[in-house]
């Protein structure tokens, strides 16, 4: 039995940022679980890590250095990232893994989610700093 | 005015375990992120976990992962950092920092620190 | 992760002078620099934030300025209370790290 996956086809990273939900075919409450979100054709880059474990904390980590973090539904998790880059736009897919309680559960390949990063120009000027930081 | 202020910090052995407290007012706690930074004797700082505003998610440095464990108890405005398995290298000063909602790793205001020496 | 190289370790200057110190990424980050002043005993001070803007309460004196892999903050008039340790601190990418840090000293 494979847990089925839905994503968006599409999102646009507005502000080089984008929140990414996968909605799986299972319910995670009081599982053990490994969702995460890889980037590209072949999914060689794992963006972002989200582990549960029974604790209402979930643990979130990238291997492969992006600025994430993490919500959990009864059936999904979503995925927030910050500091994209426009050359990371790319398809993503959304993984998910079950390990307890038994049997180990994972996921058939999800037709992924294309994000567009359109980011905003990044470029200070240090004669118009902004505004102040409270 | 913003103020935390970290407690909880002694001296303990190798292999043992201390429980950091820090208690935050003038601001609503709830709104921010949470975080600890270290700084070993003579060094530079270190960020070591951070835990979002509602508690829900946290993020530790690989050197802790396993070892040390953040929580927050929003109706007491206190921010906890649980050390486990302590080793020499974790001698430092712990403090806690906040961040707000949107930039998540940009540390506007910091305790005064709490400091943590591990040593037979 | 992104290591950040600050130099000079130590800066020997008067009061009055002007203060360059440098902060070196290993990969690009952007804007997303902060810079922090730390006294001997006290908690680290956000002085400088996405690189260029001043945080709440900072003296006009603090500037900061660079994108991508080199970021400079200038202290264009030393004052007594400015002799400290000076730290930058990238947000780009998971983890944050901090530079080793400069040491502003009274010559």
């Known amino acids: 039995n494979k847990i089925l996956v839905k994503q968006s086809p599409m999102l646009v990273a507005y502000d080089n940022a984008v929140n990414l939900s996968c909605k799986y075919s299972y319910n995670l409450f009081s599982r053990e679980f490994r969702a995460s979100l890889h980037k590209g054709l072949d999914s060689a880059v794992e963006v972002c890590v989200v582990y549960g474990n029974y604790s209402q904390q979930l643990q979130v980590y990238s291997k492969t250095g992006f600025n994430c973090d993490g919500k959990l539904g009864n059936e999904s998790v979503t995925f927030y990232l910050q500091n994209l880059y426009v050359n990371q736009t790319d398809i993503y897919f959304c993984k998910i893994e079950v390990m307890y309680p038994p049997p180990y559960l994972d996921n058939e390949k999800s037709n992924g989610t294309i994000i567009h990063v359109k980011g905003k120009h990044l470029c200070p000027s240090p004669l118009f700093p902004g505004p102040s930081k409270p | 005015e913003v103020q935390l202020v970290e407690s909880g910090g002694g001296l303990v052995q190798p292999g043992g375990s201390l429980r950091l407290s820090c208690a935050a007012s003038?601001?609503?706690?709830?709104?921010?992120?949470m975080h600890w930074v270290r700084q070993p004797p003579g060094k530079g700082l270190m960020w070591v976990s951070r835990i979002n505003s509602d508690g829900s998610t946290a993020s530790h440095a690989d050197s802790v992962r396993d070892r040390f464990s953040i929580s927050r108890d929003n109706a007491k405005n206190t921010l906890y950092l649980q050390l486990n398995g302590l080793r020499a290298e974790d001698t430092a000063v712990y403090y806690c920092?906040?961040?707000?909602?949107?930039?998540?790793?940009?540390?506007?205001?910091w305790g005064q620190g709490a400091l943590v020496t591990v040593s037979s | 992760e992104i290591v950040l190289t600050q130099s000079p370790a130590t800066l020997s200057l008067s009061p009055g002078e002007r203060a360059t110190l440098s902060c070196r990424a290993s990969q690009s980050i952007s804007i997303y620099l902060a810079w922090y002043q730390q006294k001997p005993g006290q908690a680290p001070r956000l002085l400088i934030f996405?690189?260029?803007k001043r945080a709440t309460g900072i003296p006009a004196r603090f500037s900061g300025s660079g994108s991508g892999t080199d970021f400079t903050l200038t202290i264009s008039s030393l004052e007594p209370e400015d002799f400290a340790v000076y730290s930058c601190q990238q947000r780009h990418n998971w983890p944050p790290t901090f530079g080793q840090g400069t040491k502003v000293e009274i010559k």
């Open positions: 003038g601001f609503t706690f709830s709104d921010y992120w």
């Open positions: 996405d690189a260029s």
């Open positions: 920092a906040r961040a707000d909602n949107t930039t998540w790793y940009e540390f506007d205001f």
